[in-house]
């Protein structure tokens, strides 16, 4: 498989058959698949060097792995997008052997002197062809030469099979399956041959191709493949319930932010709640996690403005649940990204020198910001798309807080909507879905560059639009939701999570 190890070295060779038998639409589809693959790999913070070859009678090398920009995913994607099927129109035979020889030439080194680290570089060839080579001879001989060059299968104690993967995608109206199978790698419990119909569900294909065992701790990563569970798609999501004898129980959500901490809303708990009465589950697992302590933001005080006629005051409504035992990350349990951390800088593919302010400008610009939250409906987790009103609609969004029960007598809305809040909901630019009571404490998320970054914690809503946890279809335009802006509670997060190796900026 393609081992996505951010500390490893990898060359990926994209080889695309542009011969007569492929056809323009299949060529375009294959290109799209490769663009998606480049993006998927880049989302892991891995920067492989790319080689890009198209071929028919002759190969054409568009990107060499030795080029300075070959590890710049955006630049490689641009080169790929600029390739036309017509480029090979005049010489449209199929010489797959020559194309693979072009790959071999990129792999080999001058004067037979291998560069430092050659033996630690993994090589991945992704060949998109119909397998109908009609000139140049059998391409399998070049695969053998490549294996020889990379010293694969020659050393009994160190076969190095994981240093070469050859994936073949069968594209075109007629595919020679025998030829395609012959070229692809053969490894136990791995799939290296894919058909056209597989390309309709690329996430399923990538799931077969990618080994992410070296990058399970990456924040904000998800798998969207069809066989995935809700927690493959939202692996950070935590379910919290507080059992209060004779008072029933409170349900909330939270987000895994590190191996020991879940971030949630402070209002989910009271000072009387004991640790043993708080149940937290992650990854869709039945068992509950043991709680060491719940850490409230020191400025949170729900009764802080009672004397001013404000029954409930949600400023600084954030809490961290510290777990007794370290979480074991996997595909259904992994952290979400937090603002102003090194992990988020890498997730957004920003320069290492990026400041907290620059992250804020990237994630929360002064405009309507597309975001999402995760809600449970009929035992299923679903993503709800909302817009954070952070531009010209911010004021009107915040003013609608006056319609909240108990806030109708508030003279100045800034008494309840402090600078700590982000506002969503309403009908412009789109009708936003609203949060339900059980969504409290869950993350408000910005999805960028295939990664998920938490910008807020769901706190309170103006209208209870969820009778019996069922969202009503018709809701008033003033149905707004308020979320604690994580950029505003960073000093506290940084202090409490200082041992979690998150690299706060």
């Amino acid at each position: 498989k393609i081992v996505l190890d951010p500390s490893g070295s990898m060359n990926i060779y994209l080889v695309l058959d542009g011969s007569d038998s492929i056809g323009a639409s299949n060529f375009t589809g294959a290109k799209k698949c490769l663009v998606n693959l480049i993006e998927k790999v880049a989302s892991y913070g891995v920067k492989p060097r790319y080689g890009l070859v198209t071929y028919a009678t002759y190969p054409k090398i568009w990107v060499k792995v030795s080029e300075a920009d070959s590890s710049n995913a955006d630049w490689v994607t641009k080169q790929l997008n600029e390739i036309n099927y017509e480029d090979h129109k005049l010489k449209s035979g199929t010489n797959t052997k020559k194309a693979l020889q072009a790959v071999y030439s990129m792999m080999s080194w001058p004067d037979d002197v291998p560069p430092e680290g050659w033996n630690r570089t993994r090589h991945v060839i992704i060949l998109m062809t119909d397998g109908l080579h009609n000139m140049g001879g059998d391409p399998i001989t070049v695969i053998d030469e490549i294996r020889d060059l990379l010293y694969i299968g020659k050393d009994r104690k160190n076969p190095r099979e994981d240093y070469l993967d050859v994936y073949v995608f069968g594209v075109g109206p007629l595919v020679n399956q025998v030829n395609i199978n012959a070229l692809a790698s053969k490894k136990d419990n791995e799939q290296h041959v894919f058909k056209v119909k597989d390309m309709e569900n690329l996430e399923d294909v990538f799931y077969q191709m990618i080994d992410e065992s070296q990058s399970l701790s990456l924040c904000g990563m998800v798998w969207e493949h069809r066989k995935g569970t809700d927690y493959h798609k939202q692996p950070w999501q935590a379910k919290i319930s507080v059992i209060r004898p004779s008072k029933g129980h409170e349900s909330c959500m939270g987000a895994v932010v590190s191996e020991y901490f879940v971030l949630t809303a402070a209002h989910c708990f009271t000072v009387d709640d004991k640790e043993h009465s708080i149940k937290v589950s992650v990854g869709g697992e039945k068992r509950d996690l043991e709680i060491e302590v719940v850490l409230f933001h020191p400025n949170y005080n729900i009764n802080g403005k009672k004397e001013a006629g404000i029954p409930e005051f949600y400023d600084y409504d954030v809490a961290l649940i510290k777990l007794k035992n370290k979480l074991k990350y996997g595909q259904t349990i992994r952290p979400i990204c937090l603002p102003c951390t090194e992990g988020t800088t890498r997730a957004l593919r920003l320069p290492p020198t990026t400041t907290c302010q620059q992250q804020k400008e990237e994630l929360l610009p002064a405009q309507d910001i597309k975001a999402l939250f995760v809600s449970e409906e009929e035992k299923k987790l679903t993503r709800k798309e909302v817009y954070i009103k952070n531009g010209d609609k911010k004021g009107s969004c915040e003013r609608d807080a006056q319609y909240a029960p108990g806030y109708d007598k508030v003279k100045d809305i800034s008494e309840v909507v402090t600078p700590r809040f982000l506002c969503t909901g309403g009908v412009s630019p789109y009708a936003d879905p609203n949060t339900c009571r059980g969504d409290s404490g869950g993350p408000l998320i910005v999805h960028k560059r295939s990664r998920f970054i938490q910008v807020g914690v769901i706190s309170w809503g103006v209208v209870d639009v969820c009778k019996n946890q069922k969202r009503q279809k018709q809701v008033p335009a003033h149905a707004r939701d308020f979320h604690i802006n994580l950029f505003q509670v960073l000093p506290w997060l940084k202090e409490k999570l200082q041992d979690e190796d998150l690299g706060f900026l």
Epitope: P114, N119, Y151, R156, R160
Partner: antibody, heavy 121, light 111 residues
Amino acid sequence: EVQLVESGGGLVQPGGSLRLSCGTTGFTFRDYYMSWVRQAPGKGLEWLGFSRHRVYGYTPEYAASVKGRFTISRDNSKNTLYLQMNSLKTEDTAVYYCARDNPGYYAMDYWGQGTLVTVSS
Amino acid sequence: EIVLTQSPATLSLSPGERATLSCKASQSVDYDGDSYMNWYQQKPGQAPRLLIYAASNLESGIPARFSGSGSGTDFTLTISSLEPEDGATYYCQQSNADPYTFGQGTKLEIK
């Protein structure tokens, strides 16, 4: 056809130095471990060390009995293996063989004919 | 280092007889499902010749009367029906752990 030919043996005084060479033909030299083995008169075989193949950067490994005194090196452009022997002792008197160590199964599948080194005053 | 002990030190048998040579290792020479034990034949004045690799695999060009068996620490070289030319010294050698080591050898005499 695989061939290994040792050279450089002879008479040397205790404390002296000698460099043995092993020229090879018939195979891709850099892809193989290459070993030195010796046999004292009337005694058994003693492995002295090897030079690993290209994946391991041709790094050497030595038997404890010669570590620090003997050095194994290779010139891949000449397909030749070397054994530099310093501070020689009378007990180093032996026939010295070079052998191709096949990483496909970690066995010495081809041997040279040997070269005799005599350490004596 | 791994010490290899061969027995018997010498063996005297007639042509057509079966020869069984033993080699015991001070610790296992197995790695990842393979036994890294090799057998060599050496005749006087000649270089050693590989007979068996990885405990039981016959090197090409070696007569089928030679066979190897064993795993872990106990290994056997068997010559099913001795020929006059089999008179030689036989060495076992392990290549599982560095440094490589040889047994002290078994001298086989043909009567």
